[in-house]
Amino acid sequence: EKLPKAPVITTPLETVDALVEEVATFMCAVESYPQPEISWTRNKILIKLFDTRYSIRENGQLLTILSVEDSDDGIYCCIANNGVGGAVESCGALQVKMKPKITRPPINVKIIEGLKAVLPCTTMGNPKPSVSWIKGDNALRENSRIAVLESGSLRIHNVQKEDAGQYRCVAKNSLGTAYSKLVKLEVEVFARILRAPESHNVTFGSFVTLRCTAIGIPVPTISWIENGNAVSSGSIQESVKDRVIDSRLQLFITKPGLYTCIATNKHGEKFSTAKAAATVSIAEWSKSQKDSQGYCAQYRGEVCDAVLAKDALVFFNTSYRDPEDAQELLIHTAWNELKAVSPLCRPAAEALLCNHLFQECSPGVVPTPMPICREYCLAVKELFCAKEWQAMEGKAHRGLYRSGMHLLPVPECSKLPSMHRDPTACTRLPYLDYKKENITTFPSITSSRPSADIPNLPASTSSFAVSPAYSMT
């Protein structure tokens, strides 16, 4: 018969390393008589025999954790007791080894240039993973602006445009490597003007192109302001290349102005703007020009709108207090007088009066008004409106126009230059050029002059040229 023997643990527990989801086994070999009762604790808490996560075999001498979890690490002890002597205990640690795992991966970030960006990368693993970052295809190097924090997060101070790109974090330990998904760092840049429009001192009536170039992320939009208001005339051409927007405003200069280029882009709910301004001044005219009796500007009236060329620059006489209104009133009065004239005469007279009262400005040393060519004046007077002109002259001689009608803007043809002497000295009336090509017969003309004085307009092939070459000086 065996003698009773107190339990002796012949194989003390050792530290066990186990990977998550793998099997970990502690062995507690006991010699004793009678056979001992063996119990197991984890962190001094009794492991229940019916806990399905464990398997206890070999009379309790073998503890197996069937699928290790990271929460299983701790101190495991086996306690053997058979009633003979005291209970004996042996303890060992379970170190749960874990391949790196990224528990809080980075996310896409939009950040304004100059601010601080933090891309998170929280990891788990045993041994503790080291965290590094990849930008594009290359390992990211830390520097005075860029650092990987203890937590694994990437911090970028004073973010620059070149920091934009695709990033991923890498967690690494002796057991393996984990990669995050690629995330995008977008660096938004406040709108900034790279090239401000230049001021110009130009001749009157010239075209000027103001150019404004801006950069930003997102690409800015450019708008133009003229003297505080949205630009009302001119054409704008835009192009975008490499996040740079180039806007060109082409203007027809008839007055000085302050032109402002405004570049705007949006960051979330907020906008950023940048402005640059340029002045367009009209080249200083000589003193004699200031002494001359008026100025050139675009016609903005209504009466002659259909007669004068679109956007025509015309002369306004400063001997009137308000030239534009005064001349418009004059032409309005004349228009009413013309209601009574014949259908042949009226459009010709309208063309004559409008072009006489609102003379076309032409460039040169300074812009100055161009009178109507004598030939066209005589065509109206002696062909289209012969009867009406005679009647008006008759009334004038009898003093019937004393009530202001002598102000009717009717030119004196003899005081107008001839296009045969200087074809660039006077304005032609396109209406008459058109009509003479389309009129084949004229009503009988009662002329105030002999027929030899009726003008011969250029390139005439129709019966409009009712005389030989009209000799004029």
């Epitope: 010239s206 075209f207 004699s288 001359s292 009796q293 956007d311 040169g364 001839s418 200087d422 000086t473």
Partner: antibody, heavy 115, light 112 residues
């Protein structure tokens, strides 16, 4: 037929003065812009001055303050007063009718500035 | 001032040949109001005064033979003589009238 006849040219010392005239015929003189253009020997053309129908004058920068253009519509005559002449003013001086284009040219009068 | 650059400075051609003379302005000479090009061409035969050939870049002055034509716009202009004649031997000048008038340096045409 338009005719422009210049006169008044000659030899003058540097710093001296000269008055050129241009008599016009064949057109209503008062209704047209008139110009002076010069041509240095073997060189190109240089516009000097224009006078409009209101007798308002304009000048090239090179002669501003030294030359004066004027007109007498009664005498149908255009003038150019040349003061403080320099050797580089030596040229054939043309009287020209025209506003935007220089349409009719005289035969010119020679001005020689030399000591 | 607007600078006018003419090319070539001289050209030699046979009777019947086509000749083109170019003129470039340092800025546009098109007047926005009427879209006319304020560019003129002149001929100066040896020992003679200049005479106007073309005005407004392409309008032929009266009395000028049809073989002379002008074209171009903005800053680039051309005078074309479609079939050179012996009497065309001369110096040709372009001139802008957009601002204070300025001339090109001239192109001498010699006939072989």
């Amino acid at each position: 037929e338009v005719q422009l006849v210049e006169s008044g040219g000659g030899l003058v010392q540097p710093g001296g003065s000269l008055s050129l005239s241009c008599v016009a015929s064949g057109f209503t003189f008062s209704l047209y812009y008139m110009n002076w253009v010069r041509q240095a020997p073997g060189k190109g053309l240089e516009w000097l001055s224009v006078i409009d129908t209101h007798s308002i004058a304009y000048y090239a920068d090179s002669v501003k303050g030294r030359f004066t253009i004027s007109r007498d519509n009664v005498k149908n005559t255009l003038y150019l007063q040349l003061n403080n002449l320099k050797p580089e003013d030596t040229a054939l001086y043309y009287c020209v009718l025209g506003r935007t284009a220089l349409v009719r040219w005289g035969q010119g009068t020679q001005v020689t500035v030399s000591s | 001032d607007i600078v006018m650059t003419q090319s070539p400075s001289s050209v030699t051609a046979s009777v019947g040949e086509k000749v083109t003379i170019n003129c470039k302005s340092s800025q546009s000479v098109v007047f926005g109001s009427n879209q006319k090009s304020y560019l003129n061409w002149y001929q100066q035969r040896p020992g003679q005064s200049p005479r106007l050939l073309i005005y407004y870049a392409s309008t032929q002055e009266s009395g000028i033979p049809d073989r002379f034509s002008g074209s171009g716009s903005t800053t680039d202009f051309t005078l074309t003589i479609s079939s050179v004649q012996p009497e065309d031997a001369a110096v040709y000048y372009c001139q802008q009238a957009y601002s204070a008038p300025t001339f090109g340096s001239g192109t001498r045409l010699e006939i072989k």
